[in-house]
């Protein structure tokens, strides 16, 4: 909501999760792994990489089925705490200028830092308009105090807010699982919010920094290394 059409393939780590229709976004973090939101879990997912217009085959797409879908063991479907999942692709993505991985964070998100949010979610705060072309939004990370004041009792240490307290610009339904990137690092995963782009109701995002060890450990535990003797 309140964003702009991204330059084509300018967000090469952005993926669309498809189950017959686009239902969530995600981020490519290595040639064979995607990170998304825990509440985007489905038993069968096709990961669509290199997408810009999700309704048109433009020639840069890679459609790869999920081989493993691993939701965080402490994901809470009622509070959306630990709202993160990992998808292992059934075959590695072909990395090129239009499909490439985003780095995991080396430090937690800092208030005031500019970030890029992207997705194919609803672009209207009142009504519904689902775009075909990838939308981008530049938005600042808010302080934890501002975040908690916006949602008293709802914000855990695994969440942070990004956006504008005055409203007007935000992620929305269909953006979940997608990236929040600051300084070339995946800081957030689109998670939830009361409405979209409402005053004093900024978007709430999963704090990826808290899960770097889990991500690395999970990838290691689910990677098959062949040892030749």
């Amino acid at each position: 909501v309140g964003g702009y059409i991204c330059e084509e393939n300018s967000v090469p780590y952005q993926v669309s999760l498809n189950s017959g229709y686009h239902f969530c976004g995600g981020s490519l973090i290595s040639e064979q792994w995607v990170v998304s939101a825990g509440h985007c879990y489905k038993s069968r997912i096709q990961v669509r990489l290199g997408e810009h217009n999700i309704e048109v085959l433009e020639g840069n797409e890679q459609f790869i089925n999920a081989a493993k879908i691993i939701r965080h063991p402490k994901y809470n479907s009622r509070t959306l705490d630990n709202d993160i999942l990992l998808i292992k692709l059934s075959s590695p993505a072909v990395i090129n200028s239009r499909v490439s991985a985003i780095s995991l964070p080396t430090a937690p998100p800092a208030a005031g830092t500019e970030s890029l949010i992207s997705g194919w979610g609803n672009t209207l705060s009142s009504g519904a308009d689902y775009p075909d072309e990838l939308q981008c939004l530049d938005a600042p990370v808010l302080s934890q105090a501002e975040c908690e004041a916006s949602y008293p009792g709802k914000i855990t240490n695994n969440m942070f807010c990004v956006g504008f307290l005055e409203g007007g610009k935000d992620s929305c339904q269909g953006d979940a699982g997608g990236p929040v990137v600051s300084n070339g690092e995946l800081q957030g995963i689109v998670s939830w919010g009361y409405g979209c782009a409402q005053k004093n109701r900024p978007g709430v995002y999963t704090k990826v920094y808290n899960y770097v060890d889990w991500i690395k450990d999970t990838i290691a535990a689910n990677s098959h290394h062949h040892h030749h003797h």
Partner: antibody, heavy 126, light 106 residues
């Protein structure tokens, strides 16, 4: 605690439009998805559709051509219209709240219902 | 459409008995399965969400399990107040309910 109350005509003529309203009290309508469900006498439950206050709706594919849902946040109400009714639409109609705390998770998916109205009986007859 | 097949359609058991109801989905729905209790003339009440999570305030004698296509709902020790019809509900793709299981006391 949140309470839901369905209201509307108990009798609708065939081919006309059934109109029902659900009033939400004890909480804000803007923090959840909201559903309509119906149940013919002695039969099972059928989901009609859901709405949230952005106006975004999802309808049961089998009823989609006849269903319209709307929301009035100023009155804390949401509504159902079902057009071209027949005797097969005779049922108890329930409104319900989505079970997720937030109702605003930003995926495109579905949940269940944790708070229900008591239901209102609608009979389609001439 | 995802079809939900519940069985049995009705059962009769004694107070204190263990009661089991099954629900089968026509395709894999992961754990997006809820269970409801409906007493005559009343609205349904959520008991179990996401296949196995007990809703707040619901007695611990109710439980759910399963994933994929096969799900089970159990009342560990049937009580007189448990007389009702129980419904499963999938939320993986739109929402559909099972046909219901009517539970009676012998």
């Amino acid at each position: 605690q949140v309470q839901l109350q369905e209201s509307g005509p108990g009798l609708v003529k065939p081919s006309e439009t059934l109109s029902l309203t659900c009033t939400v009290s004890g909480g804000s309508i803007s923090s959840h998805y909201w559903h309509w469900i119906r149940q013919p006498a002695g039969k099972g439950l059928e989901w009609i559709g859901r709405i949230h206050t952005s106006g975004s709706t999802f309808y049961n594919p089998s009823l989609k051509s006849r269903v319209t849902m709307s929301v009035d946040t100023s009155k804390n109400q949401f509504s159902l219209k079902l057009s071209s009714v027949t005797a097969a639409d005779t049922a108890v109609y329930y409104c319900a709240r989505d079970l997720t705390n937030y109702g605003w998770s930003k995926s495109i998916r579905f949940y269940g219902m944790d708070v229900w109205g008591q239901g209102t009986t609608v009979t389609v007859s001439s | 459409d995802i079809q939900m097949t519940q069985s049995p359609s009705s059962l009769s058991a004694s107070v204190g008995d263990r009661v089991t109801i099954t629900c089968q989905a026509s395709q894999d729905i992961s754990n997006y399965l809820n269970w409801y209790q409906q007493k005559p003339g009343k609205a349904p009440k959520l008991l179990i969400y996401d296949a196995s999570n007990l809703e707040t305030g619901v007695p611990s004698r109710f439980s759910g399990s399963g994933s994929g296509t096969d799900f089970t709902f159990t009342i560990s020790s049937l009580q007189p107040e448990d007389i009702a019809t129980y419904y499963c509900q999938q939320t993986d793709n739109f929402i559909t309910f099972g046909g219901g299981t009517k539970v009676e006391i012998k």
